[in-house]
Interface confidence: medium
């Protein structure tokens, strides 16, 4: 496929990586929906990777929502070990691992770590609180993970998907469906075109994974969500690569993948100026 | 009592680059403990914050993703002012800018007088 | 990015009357990073409330603000013929920074 570059993977059987989703709903951020009840309900937090207590509101919603913490743990993480791939080409870091780290303008004071390209290690700063950009994880594992050098590890799950004829829309399936794509790539990649709330007709790009290709939409300005591209080879970048085509029961696979970091956040960038 | 004076042409032909300067009384451009804005204001769009600088031992800034590659907002130190530039505009463009003193305990607390500024051939 | 929906669009009522605006957030923020602006006519809008809750200097006690997580409101308590205007909320927490569309309060 002229599309994209190829990368070579193996399969190796040793540790979970961090991220274990085995739904792709477990990756919806928390909808309490628009009515005004309070139940105590519970859901998946990406970012944590724990199931946590949120409140909704009786009504709409999305499908990361359990009755109890027990059924969240059920739907959303893996106790089992299972395989984890390695690349046999070195993986290339996200384009954030490059930025300096950033305080924000806030004033609190959150130890957080960030990758130091001169000294090629995660290091600690203190963070202000808001804003900054996405060279910043909470935990130095973490950033390991995504900065450094060294083989990258990535859960090797299905998602289960449908095309809603309805709407044309993506469906998260509540059962795993059998598949011939594994998909480890951004939650994002999963969610359906949103042309958000505004006026404007720009054209962009989404990821349709049913049809894993980059289709054009209209995008209004504002709002949506983060499966929005302005280019088809940006959209094929961050989210054709997250699929795996199996070819085989085990061994030698075929991988389209970089990692990317679930976070996403508009990063600054440093500017050197002289007085005029 | 911090003030912020605009200053800047109210027309610019499309295609060309929009200049505006806000000059700060009663505080510094290099303060440690604020960052300096523009915001603009049209009708289709409402209020939307095209960027900011800011000082923390050394300089950063933040761009708007929708006009990340046509902006950039310098500092002047020696005259406590900083700019904004815009390039390639177009109508779009058209819209009254305003420049802020962003203070991180309580959002935008000074405003400049805005700019109306007219993006016409 | 964060987008922040305000309700209603148009207020319209009487000096005197209480009004009740709302603000929806895409997704959490912080309390302490959301802020509400009054602006009148060929005005800079003027910072009302910080950290969603408190009153900015100046900014008379008929004016307050709650919430938190997605939802915020700002109420006015008894309109005065200066408060007609429209209010804008703004989140910082996230970036990039976002304002709401706006809701005017309009003299019925």
């Known amino acids: 496929d002229s599309e994209e570059d190829e990368e070579h993977t193996i399969i190796t059987d040793t540790e979970l990586p961090p991220l274990k989703l085995m739904h792709s709903f477990c990756a919806f951020k928390a909808d309490d929906g628009p009515c005004k009840a309070i139940m105590k309900r519970f859901f998946f937090n990406i970012f944590t990777r724990q199931c946590e207590e949120f409140i909704y509101g009786g009504c709409e919603g999305n499908q990361n929502r359990f009755e109890s913490l027990e059924e969240c743990k059920k739907m959303c993480t893996r106790d089992n070990a299972n395989r984890i791939i390695k690349t046999t080409l070195q993986q290339e870091k996200p384009d954030f691992c490059f930025l300096e780290e950033d305080p924000g303008i806030c004033r609190g004071y959150i130890t957080r770590y960030f990758y130091n390209n001169q000294t090629k290690q995660c290091e600690r700063f203190k963070y202000g609180g808001c804003l900054g950009n996405m060279n910043n994880f909470e935990t130095l594992e973490e950033c390991k993970n995504i900065c450094e050098d060294g083989p990258n590890g990535f859960q090797v799950d299905n998602y289960g998907t449908q095309l809603n004829a309805v709407n044309n829309s993506l469906t998260p399936q509540s059962t795993k469906v059998p598949s011939l794509f594994e998909f480890h790539g951004p939650s994002w990649c999963l969610t359906p075109a949103d042309r958000g709330l505004c006026r404007a007709n720009e054209n962009r790009f989404y990821y349709n994974s049913v049809i894993g290709k980059c289709r054009p939409f209209k995008y209004s300005g504002c709002g949506g969500n983060e499966n929005n591209f302005t280019s088809k080879q940006e959209c094929l970048r961050a989210c054709k690569k997250g699929f795996i085509q199996r070819i085989s029961k085990g061994g030698l696979i075929k991988t389209k993948r970089k990692r990317k970091k679930q976070r996403v956040k508009i990063a600054y960038e440093e500017i050197f100026v002289k007085n005029m | 009592q911090v003030q912020l004076q605009q200053s800047g042409p109210g027309l610019v032909k499309p295609s060309q680059t929009l200049s505006l300067t806000c000059a700060i009384s009663g505080d510094s451009v290099s303060s440690n403990s604020a960052a300096w804005s523009w915001i603009r204001q049209s009708p289709g769009r409402g209020l939307e914050w095209l960027g900011f600088i800011y000082y923390r031992s050394k300089w950063y800034n933040d761009y708007a993703v929708s006009v990340k590659s046509r902006i950039t907002i310098n500092p002047d130190t020696s005259k406590n002012q900083f700019s904004l530039q815009l390039n390639s505009v177009t109508p779009e463009d058209t819209a009254v800018y305003y420049c802020a003193r962003h203070n991180p305990d309580l959002g935008f607390d000074y405003w400049g007088q805005g700019t109306l500024v007219t993006v016409s051939s | 990015d964060i987008v922040l929906t305000q309700s209603p669009a148009t207020l319209s009522l009487s000096p005197g009357e209480r009004a009740t605006l709302s603000c929806r957030a895409s997704?959490?923020?912080?309390?302490?990073?959301l802020a509400w602006y009054q602006q009148k006519p060929g005005q800079a809008p003027r910072l009302l409330i910080y950290?969603?809750?408190n009153r900015a200097t100046g900014v008379p006690a008929r004016f307050s603000g709650s919430g938190s997580g997605t939802d915020f409101t700002l109420t006015i308590s008894s309109l005065e013929p200066e408060d007609f205007a429209v209010y804008y909320c703004q989140q910082f927490y996230d970036s990039p920074q976002t304002f709401g569309q706006g809701t005017k309060v309009e003299i019925k």
């Open positions: 997704q959490n923020v912080s309390s302490n990073y």
């Open positions: 950290d969603a809750s």
